[in-house]
């Protein structure tokens, strides 16, 4: 083919076209050249900048057998999934001889239905509690107007006239669905539909009604639950761990709590089988058909002390001359509190009972006196806490000591210290 008379004329015989479409579109831009001699490498430009990592392929075919014959070169730039960042002016650049040649420009534009950057999400809310939902969409083309829908009913008369990106909902009394429509010149896109589940409000005013050593009675005020009646409330009780501790509002207890369900109403529950004189933390949540409320904060409570559940054991009472020796061991049964001491009572067959507070000692020496007219002297011991006395031991007879065997007592007992209390015997 005859050569061109103007060597500086562009070798391009095809330029990039225009691609305008929605996100995700796949397209190809092409440049075509017819050059004499060695075909050049084709570079792609976007907005005047070389695309270093372009997904391009170059095909070159000689039109003759001579080295100086013409070559056809086609460079194809593939845009795999159109994004906003792909938009711009595209050109091809070749270096031929001592000259640069740039093709005519083609344009890539993003234009289609609105594209959501943010859509309303499913969530749970407490009844009659304000919350916000978010929706954001973009073109091009702009502008994009949003229209919110609640249970498929528009919340404004026309797009762009109601709330836009953030929808403030003052409160719901029933589970509802929300979506948003994005409108632009190309049409309408509808977001996902978010389900807003209405749960009961957190119960309020969790408090103790009564306390017993192994039992606590608690009550609370239920929160609003919308149109859904409460089905039950759940109470959790947790032994307080002094090392870990349960902070107010801590999301999860450090170990498995005791969980009880309460039918409602009444909004009250008796917790039994507790340890006396023990700190606990309790919390409550109430449930409707839609699900449970959030838990209340952990409330610290404590069972009061109880009396020891059993008497001291292994009581021995022996006389040696003018003295009687009595000793015993701590009750094996639970003390139900802090042991404050022991009470000892002794009594002859026809004499009044004498009561002594021994304190925390587990033995006592009694001075014996009299003419031996008192017989069948017996001793009883009880442990006590701040809550009172535990059960008394069975009467133990005071026997005279002799080697290998206790000896009977023939004298009255004279206590070494005055009794602190004088209580009825049984």
């Amino acid at each position: 083919a005859p050569r061109g008379t103007q060597a500086e004329e562009s070798p391009f015989v095809g330029n990039p076209g225009n691609i305008t479409g929605a996100r995700g579109l796949t397209g190809t831009l092409r440049c075509q050249l017819q050059v004499q001699g060695e075909p050049p490498e084709v570079h792609w430009l976007r907005d005047g900048q070389i695309l270093e990592l372009a997904d391009s392929t170059q095909t070159q075919v000689p039109l003759g057998e001579d080295e100086q014959d013409d070559w056809i070169v086609v460079s194809q730039l593939r845009i795999a999934s159109l994004q906003l960042s792909d938009a711009g002016q595209y050109q091809c650049l070749v270096f031929l001889g001592h000259q640069n040649f740039v093709s005519q420009p083609g344009y890539v534009g993003l234009e289609g239905l609105p594209y959501f950057l943010e859509e309303p999400e499913d969530r749970t809310v407490a009844a009659n509690t304000p919350f916000n939902l978010s929706c954001q969409a973009q073109g091009p083309p702009e502008p994009v107007d949003l229209l919110w829908l609640q249970d498929a009913v528009p919340l404004a008369t026309a797009p762009g006239h109601g709330p836009q990106r953030n929808l403030h909902v003052p409160g719901l009394n029933k589970t509802s669905s929300f979506s948003c429509e994005a409108h632009n010149a190309k049409g309408v896109t509808t977001s996902r539909t978010a389900t807003i589940t209405v749960l009961p409000q957190q119960p309020r005013n969790l408090h103790l009604v009564s306390r017993q050593p192994t039992e606590l009675e608690v009550a609370w005020t239920p929160g609003l639950s919308g149109i859904y009646p409460l089905t039950h409330c759940t109470l959790q009780a947790m032994l307080s761990d002094n090392e870990v501790g349960i902070q107010a509002g801590e999301p999860d207890p450090p170990e498995e709590p005791l969980t009880l369900q309460a039918s409602v109403p009444p909004h009250q529950l008796r917790l039994g089988s507790l340890h006396p004189h023990t700190p606990y933390h309790i919390r409550v949540a109430c449930t409707s058909s839609q699900g449970p409320s959030s838990w209340t904060h952990w409330l610290p409570v404590e069972t009061p002390e109880g009396v020891p559940l059993g008497p001291p054991e292994n009581i021995s009472a022996t006389r040696n001359g003018s003295q009687a020796f009595v000793h015993w061991q701590e009750p094996p049964a639970p003390l139900q509190g802090t042991l404050l001491g022991y009470r000892l009572a002794y009594q002859g067959q026809d004499t009044p009972e004498v009561l002594m507070d021994i304190g925390l000692r587990q033995e006592v020496t009694l001075e014996l006196q009299g003419d031996g007219s008192v017989s069948n002297l017996t001793v009883c011991v009880a442990a006590y806490t701040a809550a009172g006395d535990g059960p008394w031991s069975l009467p133990v007879p005071l026997e005279a000591w002799r080697p290998g065997q206790a000896q009977p007592v023939h004298q009255l007992v004279k206590e070494t210290s005055a009794p602190a209390f004088s209580w009825p015997w049984w």
Partner: antibody, heavy 120, light 107 residues
């Protein structure tokens, strides 16, 4: 509206010459490459010549090379095809056509054609 | 030279039918294929170029496809005004070459 109007066709004897013109309007003539394509009486389409927008590059098929010359006057928005050494197989309807921007060799607008008959 | 072969000189169709006209290139033309429509007494009109790019104003019932050496022009629902002569052309390299044409006619 893009408009291409060919003229200059007619009856010519074998070995004779003829100059065809194509007047362009409705677009920026000097921005587009142009081609001539002919259609034989049997309705076959044959490419005749190509010229770049500035006129610096011309291409012809081997059957035409050396006998026809394509030129353009961008000031007059006119394309010319000088034909010489005409043969009977050159008898056809001659169309001028504009190349697309995306491929100058794909032809987006054609004139109504001018008829050339080579016969003794 | 690249030879473009349209294997059917004639194709019969009914209105509303979907029809595909085929064209085969003698070598890979990198999708540089154009399709033209010519009605009696008129000049050819460009329908498709780069195998699948629809020219301005062409109804979207016309679709081009193909790659390598095999190309198709599909009319999704033939209308009366589509009855015409259809040519393929490679616009990959000079010399530009056309197929012999396929005439679309009613059954």
């Amino acid at each position: 509206e893009v408009k291409l109007v060919e003229s200059g066709g007619g009856l010519v004897q074998p070995g004779g010459s003829l100059k065809l013109s194509c007047a362009a309007s409705g677009f920026t003539f000097n921005s587009y490459s142009m081609s001539w394509v002919r259609q034989t009486p049997e309705k076959r389409l044959e490419w005749v010549a190509y010229i770049s927008n500035g006129g610096g590059r011309t291409y012809y098929p081997d059957t035409i090379k050396g006998r026809f010359t394509l030129s353009r006057d961008n000031d007059r928005n006119t394309l010319y095809l000088q034909m010489s050494s005409l043969k009977s197989e050159d008898t056809a309807m001659y169309y001028c056509a504009r190349g697309t921007t995306e491929s100058y060799y794909a032809l987006d607008y054609w004139g109504q054609g001018t008829s050339v008959t080579v016969s003794s | 030279d690249i030879v473009m072969t349209q294997s059917h000189k004639f194709m019969s169709t009914s209105l509303g039918d979907r029809i595909s006209i085929t064209c085969k290139a003698s070598q890979d033309v990198i999708t540089a294929v154009a399709w033209y429509q010519q009605k009696p007494g008129q000049s050819p009109k460009l329908l498709i170029y780069w195998a699948s790019t629809r020219h301005t104003g062409v109804p979207d019932r016309f679709t081009g496809s193909g790659s390598g050496t095999d190309y198709n022009l599909t009319i999704s629902s033939v209308q009366a005004e589509d009855l015409a002569l259809y040519y393929c052309q490679q616009h990959f390299s000079t010399p530009l070459t056309f197929g012999a044409g396929t005439k679309l006619e009613l059954k």
